[in-house]
């Protein structure tokens, strides 16, 4: 089932998706699409990278991270209720039935009229368990900045445990990195 992320109308939404290139600059094509991942590629493509660069994009959709290091997380600018739905991140790893696909559900909430609350959760509460996702190779433990150690395997949308965009933004801003062996 899809991992769920939340954002408010007028905010930027953040949908995490990561991989680590086998070698620096040796990029894997990635596509983002609106709608569940189909058999191949992405339907309703909103952004695409190739082995070198972003080669297709549409307005309001961009990669805020360093995609050359495998951070292909999608930022959707100034979201509206119409942006709600499932998004597909597909990492097009070469090989036979080898590509990785992730369906992420974006839920847009109406804008709050009350002042935005301060951070209510720390990262320890946000990660009560180890994060693990399926992969093809051995697991690798990675320390995320000054956060608690989190075990990850191979390829990850990072946040099988994350549930909202604000928290995901906090994580991104902390300089977290994920490596894939």
């Amino acid at each position: 089932s899809e991992v769920e992320y939340r954002a408010e109308v007028g905010q930027n939404a953040y949908l995490p998706c990561f991989y680590t290139p086998a070698a620096p600059g040796n990029l894997v094509p990635v596509c983002w699409g609106k709608g569940a991942c189909p058999v191949f590629e992405c339907g309703n493509v909103v952004l695409r990278t190739d082995e070198r660069d972003v080669n297709y994009w549409t307005s309001r959709y961009w990669l805020n991270g360093d995609f050359r290091k495998g951070d292909v997380s999608l930022t959707i600018e100034n979201v509206t209720l119409a942006d709600s739905g499932i998004y597909c991140c597909r990492i097009q790893i070469p090989g036979i039935m080898n590509d990785e696909k992730f369906n992420l559900k974006l839920v847009i909430k109406p804008a709050k009229v009350t002042p935005a609350p301060t951070r209510q959760r720390d990262f320890t509460a946000a990660f009560p368990r180890m994060l693990t996702t399926r992969g093809h190779g051995p697991a690798e433990t990675q320390t995320l900045g000054s956060l608690p150690d989190i075990n990850l395997t191979q390829i990850s949308t990072l946040a099988n445990e994350l549930r909202d965009s604000r928290l995901a933004n906090d994580l991104r801003d902390s300089g977290a990195t994920i490596r894939i062996g």
Partner: antibody
Framework: QVQLVESGGGLVKPGGSLRLSCAAS????????MSWIRQAPGKGLEWVSF????????YYADSVKGRFTISRDNAKNSLYLQMNSLRAEDTAVYYC????????????????WGQGTTVTVSS | EIVLTQSPGTLSLSPGERATLSCRAS???????LAWYQQKPGQAPRLLIY???SRATGIPDRFSGSGSGTDFTLTISRLEPEDFAVYYC?????????FGQGTRLEIK
């Protein structure tokens, strides 16, 4: 005009091999995923395999996995299907088809088909 | 594997009548990834509808597609003699790509 032409079919004994070819013309071949689909006599359509435009991403139906190999030569605008360890149940007309999904567009459907080539597996 | 079940197996109608063909999926398919094809004897299939409801290039407007989730429909509003053929639905939503078993539309 946009065209796909298959060749290489024929009669082969069980356990034998055959290589099908599909020559494409009239479009930028490397932009498109391509598929092989087969149709047994009097039966419906069965998807066999697809390959991405660059040739890097490949999928197979379970029924042919490990026996069939799809490949392409973009310089020659050609698609291939190497069929090994053939069985009687592989007897069919084999079609190559262009998958309509092209970079940056949102279109799923096999919009161009060849005329088909017949493969008969019989002793 | 998503199984597509088409009904009826055979539909007998006269030219000028309306034809309604059904395709039911064993699990939900995004409408973006559902296509319909027409096949005449001795010929390759021809794409009619993609994305459940979009007509392919050159397809007459008497052909229309609809539906979502698990239930999809191909409608031919007024049958022409050349429309009598076998019709297949197909899904691209998950691997493997699958086709329905076909509906044969024959002249009554």
């Amino acid at each position: 005009q946009v065209q796909l032409v298959e060749s290489g079919g024929g009669l082969v004994k069980p356990g034998g091999s055959l290589r099908l070819s599909c020559a494409a013309s009239g479009f930028t071949f490397s932009d498109y995923y391509m598929s092989w689909i087969r149709q047994a006599p009097g039966k419906g359509l069965e998807w066999v395999s697809f390959i991405s435009g660059s040739g890097s991403i490949i999928y197979y139906a379970d029924s042919v996995k490990g026996r069939f190999t799809i490949s392409r030569d973009n310089a020659k605008n050609s698609l291939y299907l190497q069929m090994n360890s053939l069985r009687a149940e592989d007897t069919a007309v084999y079609y190559c088809a262009r998958d309509g999904m092209v970079r940056g567009m949102n279109f799923y459907g096999m919009d161009v088909w060849g005329q088909g080539t017949t493969v008969t597996v019989s002793s | 594997e998503i199984v597509l079940t088409q009904s009826p197996g055979t539909l007998s109608l006269s030219p000028g009548e309306r034809a309604t063909l059904s395709c039911r999926a064993s699990q939900s398919v995004s409408s973006s990834y559902l296509a319909w094809y027409q096949q005449k004897p001795g010929q390759a299939p021809r794409l009619l509808i993609y994305g459940a409801s979009s007509r392919a290039t050159g397809i007459p407007d008497r052909f229309s597609g609809s539906g979502s989730g698990t239930d999809f429909t191909l409608t031919i509003s007024r049958l022409e003699p050349e429309d009598f053929a076998v019709y297949y639905c197909q899904q691209y939503g998950s691997s493997p790509i699958t086709f329905g078993q076909g509906t044969r539309l024959e002249i009554k």
